[in-house]
Structures are given as structure tokens and as C-alpha cells.
Amino acid sequence: LPAQVAFTPYAPEPGSTCRLREYYDQTAQMCCSKCSPGQHAKVFCTKTSDTVCDSCEDSTYTQLWNWVPECLSCGSRCSSDQVETQACTREQNRICTCRPGWYCALSKQEGCRLCAPLRKCRPGFGVARPGTETSDVVCKPCAPGTFSNTTSSTDICRPHQICNVVAIPGNASMDAVCTSTSPTRSMAPGAVHLPQPVSTRSQHTQPTPEPSTAPSTSFLLPMGPSPPAEGSTGD
């Protein structure tokens, strides 16, 4: 019989593959039907009978055309720092992704195995590189003329306001305070006008090293606890 009208199971011509959605069974030496996604092979084919497929049980799945004897188990329920972005069905595994404010520190084929909170840059430091689904925030010291007075995983260093007359000079963690009520350049919305204690650390005269981009969760590392990277806070 020509290949396209042969019914499974059939012996392929020498040098020919099986057709669409078929597999070659080494034992039967025949081309046999695969099972569709959501099913598995309950009974393998023989020379005279085709594969018998059955639906996957609850909490198990097959995503591909297959001839596996058992469906795969869906992954465990998502943890509290994750959201379920794809439910476990007969055709797909559960997918857990990190909730907002967290990033994936240890990914798996689909979704995330381990989430970690995004690093927060402390006052005097701003976000150099924002966090993504799979990477932590990178903090950098605020350059001369800029400041950040927040502990945040999103705030960048903002320019000091420019005063006609300076009451308190700005530093890396505090905006300049003007004596005049009308600075020449208004600051960014939401900026704090109240004077804050000036840091004793020499913010601008000494270059501060770029903080480590290591995850803020020390439990990921095969070593004892270590202090958080400079410019970041663990909470």
C-alpha cells in the first residue's frame, strides 16, 4: 500500500520514516499512532493492534504527542512569593512566576523554582539597573549633584534642586535646602523639602565602589550569611 493510505500499525518501507504523529515501535517493528497531548499510552502497539491511549489522571499531564506509559506529575503548588500563571491541566504543567517586587533567582524550564525579593537601594544610592523577571536590582552611589533619600528598589538618583541661596547643601542622601521659597529649578514631584541630618560619610570626595550584583538572599550561596551588598538593604 502507498504510505499515505496505510493504517497504523504498518511496517514502513525500508529507508522510510513513519508519518505525521506516528512513532516506530522497536518491539513490534511497526509504525504506530502516538497519543495526543493530555493522553498517554495505556497499551503499546503490536503487529496487529495500534496504541491504546488513555487520558491523564488528575494532577498529571503530557504536553506533547507521545507514547509514554505514564503522564508526568504537575509541579507542586506555587509558594507564597509566587503567582500561578498557568494552571495544571491534562495538557500542561503548572507554571509559577514571581510576584511583583520579587525576581527569579533560580529558574526552571518554565517558570521559577525560587523567587527572591528585589534589592532595595538605601539612601545615598539609586537604581542603576532595574530588576527584571530574572535579575536583581543593581544599585549605584548617587553622583555629585544627585541624591536619593529613599530605601527603594525603583527610585533612581535625582538631581539636587538649584537654590538662589543654599541653606543646607545637598549630599548623596539629601536634597539641597534653599533659603528662598522659590528655587530656580523645581525638584522632581514628591521630593522631600525638609532638612535631614547631613551624613558624616564623605559622599562625593571619595569614589564609592560599585555594589555587588550578588543576590540579596545569602541563602542562595553555598556559604555562611554575609552582610548585604553595599548600597542595598536586606528588607
Epitope: A3, Q4, G15, L20
Partner: antibody, heavy 119, light 107 residues
Framework: QVQLVQSGAEVKKPGASVKLSCKAS????????INWVRQAPGQGLEWIGW????????QFNENFKGKATMTVDESTSTAYMEVRSLRSDDTAVYYC????????????WGQGTTVTVSS | DIQMTPSTSSLSASVGDRVTITCRAS??????LNWYQQKPGKAVKLLIY???KLHSGVPSRFSGSGSGTDFTLTISSLQPEDFATYYC?????????FGGGTKLELK
């Protein structure tokens, strides 16, 4: 990234043969079928067949049995197709494409090789 | 062999338009319908497989629908880079066959 790079254009006389190549990179060559598809000038696409690189077994469109031969060189991740007894109506762009045998689609295509058959 | 026939060989549209391209199979092909985009001098690109599954990296403005014998490719808001020729292809039975193609042109 996953890509298929095909050999350059060919001009052949009627009755001659031509051997086209398709070099794969960016994935495990032996785990996907390589299909060949042709497109005559101003025409649609026509599937010629596929080869499974793991064992070299093939599946042909009946219209091309005896006309085309597909082979692979696993060591260089290259697929070849030889077309024999060329006629003017074999003038076409020949594409190689990576295929999925469950859904019958072609997810990665080569840039195509133009074969001109002219006396 | 299964014949695949596009409803039209060419179609004119403007940027921002919602465009539908249809394709009919000569017999039932279940959901085994794939769509491709071809631009001159460029490699052919898979857009949609198994009637409605979006291939990785394809913009979400492309979608597919239909079943049995009648299928539709929809572009929700046409972009300048979408002017090309579109092919349907059945993956139900061998030999695999393509439709004649629909050329999408600027109005």
C-alpha cells in the same frame, strides 16, 4: 540562534543533476526533520519531503520519488538534496526547513537556493 | 492530496487596519493548519501553527481561527512590516500542501 544556511545559486542544463546543501546550527541537528520545499517562479510552495538526520530515513511527496534524493552528514550538521534529470520546470527556489512531525509545520527556514535549468 | 485555497490572491489595506486572510481546505484537516509570512529576499517565517498557536517571537497582533475546512489569519492592527505574502499549509496528512498565497499590499 537557530539557523539554516543554504548553498549558492546554480545554473544547470536539462538532464543534469544538482546537489544542494543546507547547514544547520544553533540546535541539535539529529533531533529534527529537515524538509525540502520548492517554489517555482510566481508559484506557491511545494513540499518535496523530509529526512530524519538521526537515521537518514526519509519521507517523500510521491511526485518527487525517484526525482530527489535526500542525505545528511551528521558530522557537519548538513543536509543535502540531489535533484536528477533536471527539466526547465524544475527551475525554482529550493528551501530547506526544520520540521515538526506532530503538527506538520516548518519553524525555521533557509534563505533558499535558486536553481535555473536552461539550455 | 489535500488542496488548500486562499480566498483571494491579493489584498489591499492600510497601516492600522484589521485584516483577515482566509484559506479553505478541500477536506477536513481538524486543527492542523499553519500560517507563514514571506517577504522578497527574506527567509519564510512561521506565524501560527495548529490553527491558533502563536509561534515564539511572533507579535500578538497575529491570530488564527477556524476549524475543519475554513481557517482565518487575522492581523488586528496592520503594521508597515506586515506587507508580505501569506501562505496557509495543512499538517494533517501527507503530502503536506500549501495554499497559493495571499499578497498583502499597501492601499
Amino acid at each position: 540562534q537557530v539557523q539554516l544556511v543554504q548553498s549558492g545559486a546554480e545554473v544547470k542544463k536539462p538532464g543534469a543533476s544538482v546537489k544542494l546543501s543546507c547547514k544547520a546550527s544553533g540546535y541539535t541537528f539529529i533531533t529534527y526533520d529537515i524538509n525540502w520545499v520548492r517554489q517555482a517562479p510566481g508559484q506557491g510552495l511545494e513540499w518535496i519531503g523530509w529526512i530524519y538526520p538521526r537515521d537518514g530515513n526519509t519521507q517523500f511527496n510521491e511526485n518527487f520519488k525517484g526525482k530527489a534524493t535526500m542525505t545528511v552528514d551528521e558530522s557537519t550538521s548538513t543536509a543535502y538534496m540531489e535533484v536528477r534529470s533536471l527539466r526547465s520546470d524544475d527551475t525554482a527556489v529550493y528551501y530547506c526547513a526544520r520540521g515538526d512531525r506532530d503538527y506538520g509545520y516548518f519553524d525555521v527556514w533557509g534563505q533558499g537556493t535558486t536553481v535555473t535549468v536552461s539550455s | 492530496d489535500i488542496q488548500m485555497t486562499p480566498s483571494t490572491s491579493s489584498l489591499s489595506a492600510s497601516v492600522g487596519d484589521r485584516v483577515t486572510i482566509t484559506c479553505r481546505a478541500s477536506q477536513d484537516i481538524s486543527n492542523y493548519l499553519n500560517w507563514y509570512q514571506q517577504k522578497p529576499g527574506k527567509a519564510v517565517k512561521l506565524l501560527i501553527y495548529f490553527k491558533s498557536k502563536l509561534h515564539s517571537g511572533v507579535p500578538s497582533r497575529f491570530s488564527g481561527s477556524g476549524s475543519g475546512t475554513d481557517f482565518t489569519l487575522t492581523i488586528s492592527s496592520l503594521q508597515p512590516e506586515d506587507f508580505a505574502t501569506y501562505y496557509c499549509q495543512q499538517g494533517n496528512t501527507l503530502p503536506l500542501t500549501f495554499g497559493g498565497g495571499t499578497k498583502l499590499e499597501l492601499k
